[in-house]
Amino acid sequence: MMTGTIETTGNISAEKGGSIILQCHLSSTTAQVTQVNWEQQDQLLAICNADLGWHISPSFKDRVAPGPGLGLTLQSLTVNDTGEYFCIYHTYPDGTYTGRIFLEVLESSVAEHGARFQIP
């Protein structure tokens, strides 16, 4: 039975040209994490694997930095970065846990951080 929960940074906004940290936290499970994937819609951004470390997709290498922790930092944001981002925790023996973050990249300086929420 999957008992874990993922807490994410929820709905967030940031300014064009700036940077933002995407974070997910898996808790309430003793399952061993073997890999964490970061995806934007259907595109793979980055992987952190237990044995291989970090892999950043070549198309995002210049704008994505791993960390802090298992999070992901997006840099030089453009309006096209607006959309859904997913963290996918691969665990044993539980299986897969997925968290969702919605990022809105704004033209002006009215960007505010949204509330945090939990995905069971």
Partner: antibody, heavy 117, light 107 residues
Framework: QVQLQQPGSELVRPGASVKLSCKAS????????MHWVKQRHGQGLEWIGN????????NYDEKFKNKGTLTVDTSSNIAYMHLSSLTSEDSAVYYC??????????WGQGTTLTVSS | DIVLTQSPATLSVTPGDSVSLSCRAS??????LHWFQQKSHESPRLLIN???QSISGIPSRFRGSGSGTDFTLTINSLETEDFGVYFC?????????FGGGTKLEIK
């Protein structure tokens, strides 16, 4: 197996600079953060900063921004920390540590830096 | 910066006892908290990561719990090899920070 090799000790004069090294082996050097940690006289641990060899991205604690510079040589899998304008306060053990999925899972043995005239 | 406060600073215990070490964060760090053991003249060793995740090769008597701002490392049935200094560390945000440590000594 994963190893982080550091020289045992370095002796330098006050006001001078030193470049500490950390030779990584047994894993893909460019895929893991390398951190540097300071420990004085067996006291607490202080995080200095880190570098991601795959991109050269660095982060520093504000306290060490004007003291240390982190670099890597990806052709030889060596991480470096350059410390400048050394004083007795910089005398300490300096560790390098790898961070991946499982946090700081491997540490070097530490280099004891002595700043003395 | 996130400040991690460990208590007590020193703990005198007898082998066979069970102990709980505390680490408190100055702000919510979710579960981005790791525990290390350091023996004299040795490098730190990772015991628990992400608050409660066990590490391969670490005895099961070491258990981590907590989330948010309050974290605990519990060591059941202490063995003589467990004496040393224990540090917590956060990876929720740069700069990473360490707690001041708890020294576990033989009574």
């Amino acid at each position: 197996q994963v190893q982080l090799q550091q020289p045992g000790s370095e002796l330098v004069r006050p006001g001078a600079s030193v470049k500490l090294s950390c030779k990584a082996s047994g894993y893909t050097f460019t895929s893991y953060w390398m951190h540097w940690v300071k420990q004085r006289h067996g006291q607490g641990l202080e995080w200095i900063g880190n570098i991601f060899p795959g991109s050269g991205t660095t982060n520093y604690d504000e306290k060490f921004k004007n003291k240390g510079t982190l670099t890597v040589d990806t052709s030889s899998n060596i991480a470096y920390m350059h410390l400048s304008s050394l004083t007795s306060e910089d005398s300490a053990v300096y560790y390098c540590a790898r961070e991946g999925l499982y946090a700081f899972d491997y540490w070097g043995q530490g280099t004891t830096l002595t700043v003395s005239s | 910066d996130i400040v991690l406060t460990q208590s007590p600073a020193t703990l005198s215990v007898t082998p066979g006892d069970s102990v709980s070490l505390s680490c408190r964060a100055s702000q919510n760090i979710r579960n981005s908290l790791h525990w290390f053991q350091q023996k004299s003249h040795e490098s730190p060793r990772l015991l628990i990561n992400y608050a409660s995740q066990s590490i391969s090769g670490i005895p099961s008597r070491f258990r981590g719990s907590g989330s948010g701002t309050d974290f605990t490392l519990t060591i059941n049935s202490l063995e003589t090899e467990d004496f040393g200094v224990y540090f917590c560390q956060q990876s929720n945000s740069w700069p990473y920070t360490f707690g001041g440590g708890t020294k576990l000594e033989i009574k």
